[in-house]
Amino acid sequence: YDFTNCDFEKIKAAYLSTISKDLITYMSGTKSTEFNNTVSCSNRPHCLTEIQSLTFNPTAGCASLAKEMFAMKTKAALAIWCPGYSETQINATQAMKKRRKRKVTTNKCLEQVSQLQGLWRRFNRPLLKQQ
């Protein structure tokens, strides 16, 4: 999906209002310096592409993020504020959620959510030059 035509300001507002807090809740008890940010993005559409991938695509050691509150809100935000955000994407997230039976917070998931926090922060500062 091409995120170019999303309402970035509304998505940013949703992140600042609620999604960021849900991410912090998920990470509670983890030191902010515990993980190095290895995933980056260059502009807002690219950031949303990476955010969607990390949020909804299971990875080795962490197949369990799609049912978290921050993920549900991310999905809702994209469905409302990204015109034509495809049913394929939505259906893919549903499939990810069905595959998982119980909530398990692994260290790998914490690392992945730490990467997500970095991507969201980058999304909120689109004019900053890439390091």
Epitope: A14, S17, T18, I19, A76, A77, A79, I80, E87, I90
Partner: nanobody, 119 residues
């Protein structure tokens, strides 16, 4: 001004069904999604389900497979069909614009509709 009016609640036995309605004025599904939320006595308000104008839906784990959200765009009304009800579904049910939920609100919730599941 946006107005949302919930109805359809009542007393039902465990295993029973209810259908809630949310009539909206001042907002259309074209520009937002409608969601159902609930608040049980002594608990925080929680997300139940949402639907947008393309029929995309999402559900809380606790209701998936038992509740179905739908909408009639021509009537600007959202529905929540609740089947296989359990005592833990007892709560006041509210509808709201999903955008407001994402943005930390709504500041003013409607009166809601009470669902009591008890034998």
């Amino acid at each position: 001004e946006v107005q949302l009016v919930e109805s359809g609640g009542g007393l039902v036995q465990p295993g029973g069904s209810l259908r809630l309605s949310c009539a909206a004025s001042g907002v259309t599904l074209d520009t937002d999604a409608m969601g159902w939320f609930r608040q049980a006595p002594g608990k925080e308000r929680e997300f139940v389900a949402w639907i947008n104008n393309r029929g995309t839906t999402d559900y809380a784990d606790s209701v998936k497979g038992r509740f179905t959200i739908s909408a009639d765009n021509s009537k600007n009304t959202a529905y929540l069909q609740m089947n296989s009800l359990k005592p833990e579904d007892t709560a006041v049910y509210y509808c709201a614009r999903v955008s407001q939920w994402l943005l930390g609100g709504p500041a003013n919730w409607g009166q809601g509709t009470l669902v009591t599941v008890s034998s």
